[in-house]
């Protein structure tokens, strides 16, 4: 059985302040079951940006229908980007457990924020 991969196709994305940023992520398998989470940064201080399973993330919208049973597209759209949103974003697959166990991370996508055009 082929090992699950998490693919973030863009190494970097540049967005003007005030616009929306799309961060792409796909998984190559639905197995093992478990949620996808998005983080900014790495290590214990990383910031949770989106959790497929729970939480309120008012600026984050899944690009694809997250309730599809065969969904393997975990791309997200972040609205109203500001310079404070700059950083590297990681799409991370977890295996179910108590607690869920981190299984595989994408390579990361660096978001840079351009000044709003005058």
């Amino acid at each position: 059985e082929e090992e699950l991969q998490v693919i973030q196709p863009e190494k970097s994305v540049s967005v003007a302040a005030g616009e929306s940023a799309t961060l792409n992520c796909t998984a190559t398998s639905l197995i093992p079951v478990g949620p996808i989470q998005w983080f900014r940064g790495v290590g214990p201080g990383r910031e949770l940006i989106y959790h497929q399973k729970e939480g309120h993330f008012p600026r984050v919208t899944p690009v694809s229908d997250p309730t599809k049973r065969n969904n393997m597209d975990f791309s997200i759209r972040i609205s109203n980007i500001t310079p404070a949103d700059a950083g590297t974003y990681y799409c991370v697959k977890f295996r179910k457990g108590s607690p869920d166990v981190e299984l595989k991370s994408g390579a990361g996508t660096e978001l840079s924020v351009r000044a709003k055009p005058s």
Partner: antibody, heavy 117, light 107 residues
Framework: DVQLVESGGGVVRPGESLRLSCAVS????????MSWVRQAPGKGLEWVSG???????YYVDSVKGRFTISRDNSKNTLYLQVNSLTAEDTAIYYC???????????WGLGTLVTVSS | ALTQPASVSANLGETVKITCSGG??????YGWYQQKSPGSAPVTVI????ERPSDIPSRFSGSASGSTATLTITGVRVEDEAIYYC???????????FGAGTTLTVL
């Protein structure tokens, strides 16, 4: 409070059709996948069909081609069109809200479908 | 197919465990559904293996390991008498399945 209220059941003859409805309230219907689960008299629960928030559909093999699940997000209503009914389809039909991983957290009271000649 | 015992009994206040086997933990999530009488609306007591809805008492808990899911009721009460169905979502077939149900009798 989350509420799911089924309707549309009744007594029909083999080969006939019905349209079951499930009116929901108390949550944002358009954000949740939904399912129909049935229970034949004296039997256990059987998942029948599911639908994603965007309208992708899934069926148990025994009803494929005969049953059609649909939803109207503007009316907060889930539907199940049941055609070519047989005695084996006699059951209480429950609608259920799906969790993020396609289990069920809330159920309706059910509507009874009886197929009899 | 999910396999669970047809019936279990426990004395009032005891801890009772109901098992459900036959799934693969890597591709399945499990839930437990309580039905007080045949034909009455099911009530979810556990979903996502071990998560409990906010209105379900803390004496209900769930776990899953390998091919077996377990529902545990700690300090069972008379009102817990019911049929308990385990259910699973299979991420490899996109289908839901249920066990045949376990009738819990409180003595």
């Amino acid at each position: 409070d989350v509420q799911l209220v089924e309707s549309g059941g009744g007594v029909v003859r083999p080969g006939e059709s019905l349209r079951l409805s499930c009116a929901v309230s108390g949550f944002r219907f358009s954000s949740h996948a939904m399912s129909w689960v049935r229970q034949a008299p004296g039997k256990g629960l059987e998942w029948v069909s599911g639908i994603s928030s965007g309208g992708d559909t899934y069926y148990v093999d025994s009803v494929k081609g005969r049953f059609t699940i649909s939803r109207d997000n503007s009316k907060n209503t889930l539907y199940l069109q049941v055609n070519s009914l047989t005695a084996e389809d006699t059951a209480i039909y429950y609608c259920a809200r799906e969790t993020w991983n396609h289990l069920f957290d809330y159920w309706g009271l059910g509507t009874l479908v009886t197929v009899s000649s | 197919a999910l396999t669970q015992p047809a019936s279990v009994s426990a004395n009032l206040g005891e801890t009772v465990k109901i098992t459900c086997s036959g799934g693969d933990s890597s591709s399945h999530y499990y839930g437990w559904y309580q039905q007080k009488s045949p034909g009455s609306a099911p009530v979810t007591v556990i979903y996502s293996d071990d998560e409990r809805p906010s209105d379900i008492p803390s004496r209900f808990s769930g776990s899953a390991s390998g091919s077996t899911a377990t529902l545990t009721i700690t300090g069972v009460r008379v009102e817990d008498e019911a049929i308990y169905y385990c259910g699973a979502y299979d991420g490899s077939t996109y289908a839901n399945t249920f066990g045949a149900g376990t009738t819990l009798t409180v003595l």
